[in-house]
Amino acid sequence: HHHHHHPASVQLHEAVELHHWCIPFSVDGQPAPSLRWLFNGSVLNETSFIFTEFLEPVANETVRHGCLRLNQPTHVNNGNYTLLAANPSGRAAAFVMAAFMDNPFEFNPEDPIPVSFSPVDTNSTSGDPVEK
């Protein structure tokens, strides 16, 4: 089925903290969609402090999982993160609101993080940013 085209789809999940913070995402589509992040509506400049990182691909699957990695974000990083995915068959978007503290360890998982989703195409969903 790999040669068949299917439209881009994208999912965002809640941010989690590992050695760093991660906004997990899943993206699907054939051919593999191009990705672009927006922060508060503007193109996000990726650097060694904020960057996209993919997990190892699973054999025979077109879906890719990854993180937008943020190194100990502060209030500067609070806002709306949008992931845009596009391929020749379609485009999709998902967004999530992330609220970070100056100190990630002060994050209270019981405080709800508001999440909204604006479908640009079908098959796009969003969760909360989570702490890994």
Partner: antibody, heavy 116, light 107 residues
Framework: EVQLLESGGGLVQPGGSLKLSCKAS????????LGWMKQRPGHGLEWIGD????????FYNENFKGKVTLTADKSSNTAYMQLSSLTSEDSAVYLC?????????WGQGTTLTVSS | EIVMTQSPATLSLSVGERVTLSCKAS??????VSWYQQKPDQSPKLLIY???SRHTGVPDRFTGSGSETDFTLTISSVQAEDLAAYHC?????????FGGGTKLEIK
């Protein structure tokens, strides 16, 4: 305790090349990018580039492209910076630093002197 | 590239005085500013990241503030061990850039 230990500096003739090392310890080497900086008296700090040991990805300052190559050996937790076609302008202290919360841990620096 | 301009270039203060160092960016750097302390013959040490967050172990007499293009580092009560050069840097967009530094001397 996070530590970055630099080595490899010294006296090199113009036109020569040199490979500087930055050995990391006290943290997961492949989880963080490493930055390299150049410092000369009266010039402040100059960012040379960043290297991500997990993937080999690099970002270079355009001013250093062709002059510098960043690599790493994951098995020894060591990052390297190769400098080529050296001139007197390359004489400086070179520093590696972990890209964590800002450049949060720095090596002690290693001095390169280019002279005939 | 973004130019970071620090002022003053040098400062001479007595122990116990309050000091404010300035760092101005040539364009908006979104709060991605760090402050570094470099003592004589040592490598830089991170004091402040994200414009206002103190790095681990940094004394609370060091405070960072500012946003967009104007940033300050305040030392509420200067100590003898604060003799150093202080550098600001932006890690908002490549190439990362640093200011020329402010040298703090103790009277």
């Amino acid at each position: 305790e996070v530590q970055l230990l630099e080595s490899g500096g010294g006296l090199v003739q113009p036109g020569g090349s040199l490979k500087l090392s930055c050995k990391a310890s006290g943290y997961a080497f492949t989880n963080y990018w490493l930055g390299w900086m150049k410092q000369r008296p009266g010039h402040g700090l100059e960012w040379i580039g960043d290297f991500y040991p997990r993937t080999g990805n690099t970002f270079y300052n355009e001013n250093f492209k062709g002059k510098v190559t960043l690599t790493a050996d994951k098995s020894s937790n060591t990052a390297y910076m190769q400098l080529s076609s050296l001139t007197s302008e390359d004489s400086a202290v070179y520093l590696c630093a972990r890209a964590g919360t800002g450049f949060d841990y720095w090596g002690q620096g290693t001095t390169l002197t280019v002279s005939s | 590239e973004i130019v970071m301009t620090q002022s003053p270039a040098t400062l001479s203060l007595s122990v116990g005085e309050r000091v404010t160092l300035s760092c101005k960016a040539s364009e908006n750097v979104g709060g991605y500013v760090s402050w570094y302390q470099q003592k004589p013959d040592q490598s830089p040490k991170l004091l402040i990241y994200g414009a206002s967050s103190r790095h681990t172990g940094v004394p609370d007499r060091f405070t960072g503030s500012g946003s967009e293009t104007d940033f300050t580092l305040t030392i509420s009560s200067v100590q003898a061990e604060d003799l150093a050069a202080y550098h600001c840097g932006q890690n908002y967009i490549y190439p990362f850039t640093f200011g020329g530094g402010t040298k703090l001397e103790i009277k």
